[in-house]
Amino acid sequence: MRTEAQVPALQPPEPGLEGAMGHRTLVLPWVLLTLCVTAGTPEVWVQVRMEATELSSFTIRCGFLGSGSISLVTVSWGGPNGAGGTTLAVLHPERGIRQWAPARQARWETQSSISLILEGSGASSPCANTTFCCKFASFPEGSWEACGSLPPSSDPGLSAPPTPAPILRADLAGILGVSGVLLFGCVYLLHLLRRHKHRPAPRLQPSRTSPQAPRARAWAPSQASQAALHVPYATINTSCRPATLDTAHPHGGPSWWASLPTHAAHRPQGPAAWASTPIPARGSFVSVENGLYAQAGERPPHTGPGLTLFPDPRGPRAMEGPLGVR
């Protein structure tokens, strides 16, 4: 959840008082301060309820509590997306919505929340504590996923208020990258402020060799670094059997949208809900958890009017031998 910190206004030092370190001490604290003020741990909430009108129909609502912009939402059934569940719907702010049975109606409720109705006819309804998961890919927080289920004792038409995730998983950039950088930044900022307070103002001493202020860079872990670090998380009893404790390993972010430009908001939206852009397989991309995805492999040939979410549907989440990514 985003937290706002009250920070006293800092008076910029008088011009000419800063020496060789002037540029850095002026720019860096402000960059770090901005990060510290706007920083907070994003959260994903999931609400599952059974409709009173149609007893076998479920409504899943998910929301993202964070300050970043959402680039993709994936809803899955049976477990986390990319780690045991099957995709029910994929919602993209511009390319539209794609859904698979038994999803009946997926839609955006707000800019940061979605809802999904699961059909009740034709198949048996999922058992009361079936797992439903929502994964939000956002910039700059990374990918955050939460899972929820309908409590077995729930009355039709009733549901618990949306609660923060029974499981809250951030892919490594979210946890280690942003949090680590911010923690370090905030500590460093305090250190700078303390030093600035206790140190007499240096004389003006221009130097041609003064280092430039370091540029802020997006932290983008490679898939190799992700693979090396596992983030275990536990599920509550969300299966139709006795509770089991599962350890899952984070996968790269959803690289189906890899061909999106850096600033997707400026991309003109076509009339079709899904653009006819070929999207390569997960394995052919290096996932960058800040919501921007860099292509590592060759762009596949355009194969038709439908959106090619990945050229090799038998393609893996990890390489699967000769049938893996081409």
Partner: antibody, heavy 118, light 106 residues
């Protein structure tokens, strides 16, 4: 490479149950859901249901509810389907099929022939 | 449930000939999937999302359609294409398949 190895053919008497298996290899077993599909001369291909290996959650075609029960054993990377109270109508080839990265029957087992005969 | 009707049920084609088969849905579906099954073999994914070729599928195969009407085309028939072709929808549970179109080589 990804392989789904199913158990051998079964010849059973009417009224009894049979449990067939599908062992996955070449991929991380809990990461993908499994489907079961029936193929008979009379009805072509029929979808029986889906099971999440990860959570054990299931969803059945209403037609097969009470007839088929899907389970998994993660430790042996095996999915099972038990067919109860067998009749001649249940004589068919049963396939397990794994999804790809999005829903579709990307990989299929070789099939298990179940023959119900008195 | 959504009923998928395939036609023709059986057809023959000479090598090099263009082959087209259709699949009509009882209600609108978003995408169609096509599978090829040869005798004594399991079905094999051929086309997904209406028009996209699965891995290893020759480019002579193509799919098209929308709403309730879909088709699969073999640009130039080859002997190895003799098989039964099934369409399948993923828009509504229960998932359903067509009865199949059997393609024989003349």
């Amino acid at each position: 490479q990804v392989q789904l190895q199913q158990s051998g053919p079964e010849v059973v008497r009417p009224g009894v149950s049979v449990k067939i298996s599908c062992k996955g290899s070449g991929y991380k077993f809990p990461d993908y859901v499994m489907h079961w599909v029936k193929q008979s001369h009379a009805k072509s291909l029929e979808w029986i249901g889906i099971i999440s290996i990860y959570s054990g959650n299931t969803n059945y075609n209403q037609k097969f509810k009470g007839k088929a029960t899907m389970t998994v054993d993660k430790s042996s990377s095996t999915a099972y389907m038990e067919l109860a109270r067998l009749t001649s109508e249940d004589s068919a080839i049963y396939y397990c099929a794994r999804e790809g990265d999005l829903p579709m029957f990307a990989y299929w087992g070789q099939g298990t022939l179940v023959t119900v005969s008195a | 449930q959504i009923v998928l009707t395939q036609s023709p049920a059986i057809m023959s084609a000479s090598p090099g000939e263009k082959v087209t088969m259709t699949c009509n849905a009882s209600s609108s579906v978003s995408y169609m999937y096509w599978y090829q099954q040869k005798p004594i073999s399991s079905p094999r994914l051929l086309i997904y999302d209406t028009s996209n070729l699965a891995s290893g599928v020759p480019v002579r195969f193509s799919g098209s359609g929308s709403g309730t009407s879909y088709s699969l085309t073999i640009g130039r028939m080859e002997a190895e294409d003799a098989a039964t072709y099934y369409c399948q929808q993923w828009s509504s549970y229960p998932l359903t398949f067509g009865a199949g179109t059997k393609v024989e080589v003349k």
